[in-house]
Interface confidence: low
Amino acid sequence: FERTRSLQDPCSNCPAGTFCDNNRNQICSPCPPNSFSSAGGQRTCDICRQCKGVFRTRKECSSTSNAECDCTPGFHCLGAGCSMCEQDCKQGQELTKKGCKDCCFGTFNDQKRGICRPWTNCSLDGKSVLVNGTKERDVVCGPSPADLSPGASSVTPPAPAREPGHSPQ
């Protein structure tokens, strides 16, 4: 049914934004409203994506390019081309099947998306904890204990044994 494209094929002359209309002697017809063709020589204009509900329009559809969506405030994009919108959480939380949950002790999340990650274990680098970690912030590692002046002390918490992506429910 689909003919092979050749120099004799009149469809090859149809630019982006049009389609080759078999019903009208293969003339190039403009894409109807709410449709587009992003390349020349097309026999169809694809229907524009509509950004609805939790999606909002980042770029309007034109006759030559599809609409692009992003997410309304309180949500963020996931997947190629923002195929999904996922709920934001607060810093210091992660999204679980039961909603936003605080990071458990020894972990942090400094973004509104993603999972809680373990604090850096300063001692692995031979350093000490300069600033303690919180749910929202990683620890800040300082000089190694040997570099500290006599009498100074630092606290290095044990590294939490925790599988990423899991919170206490």
Epitope: F1, C11, F19, C20, D21, N22, N23, Q26, C31, P32, N34, S35, Q42, R43, T44, C45, D46, I47, R49, Q50, K52
Partner: nanobody
Framework: QVQLQESGGGLVQAGDSLRLSCAAS????????MAWFRQAPGKEREFIGR????????DYADSVKGRFTISRDNPKNTLYLQMNNLKPEDTAVYYC???????????????????WGQGTQVT
């Protein structure tokens, strides 16, 4: 996933009326044009009519023009086919289909439609 389910078919007499429904699920129904086709035993699938995504434009086959009317209820994700003054030659399995694109093959050809229901029999 995308699903289309026709209902409302049955056994009727010549001159009767019947309304078919097509319930859609799994996608943004109001983004797409929709069509009805039918297929009688031993015959090719035949275009009946098509309704634009917003209900703004319609196209009907000559064989049903003036007797059949397509409508849609976007909030209910449902397409309808109102059939009046039925004739013996209207006996067929009736299918609804989702329009994938504006196609150079034309809106009356099956190639322009990507998802189809299972069909409902009208006798």
């Amino acid at each position: 996933q995308v699903q289309l389910q026709e209902s409302g078919g049955g056994l009727v007499q010549a001159g009767d009326s019947l309304r078919l429904s097509c319930a859609a699920s799994g996608w943004a129904f109001d983004n797409y044009g929709m069509a009805w086709f039918r297929q009688a035993p031993g015959k090719e699938r035949e275009f009946i009519g098509r309704l634009a995504w917003n209900g703004g434009s319609t196209d009907y086959a000559d064989s049903v023009k003036g007797r059949f009317t397509i409508s849609r209820d976007n909030p209910k994700n449902t397409l309808y086919l109102q059939m009046n003054n039925l004739k013996p030659e209207d006996t067929a399995v009736y299918y609804c289909a989702r329009q994938r694109s504006y196609s150079g093959y034309g809106i009356r050809t099956p190639q322009t439609y990507d998802y189809w229901g299972q069909g409902t029999q009208v006798t």
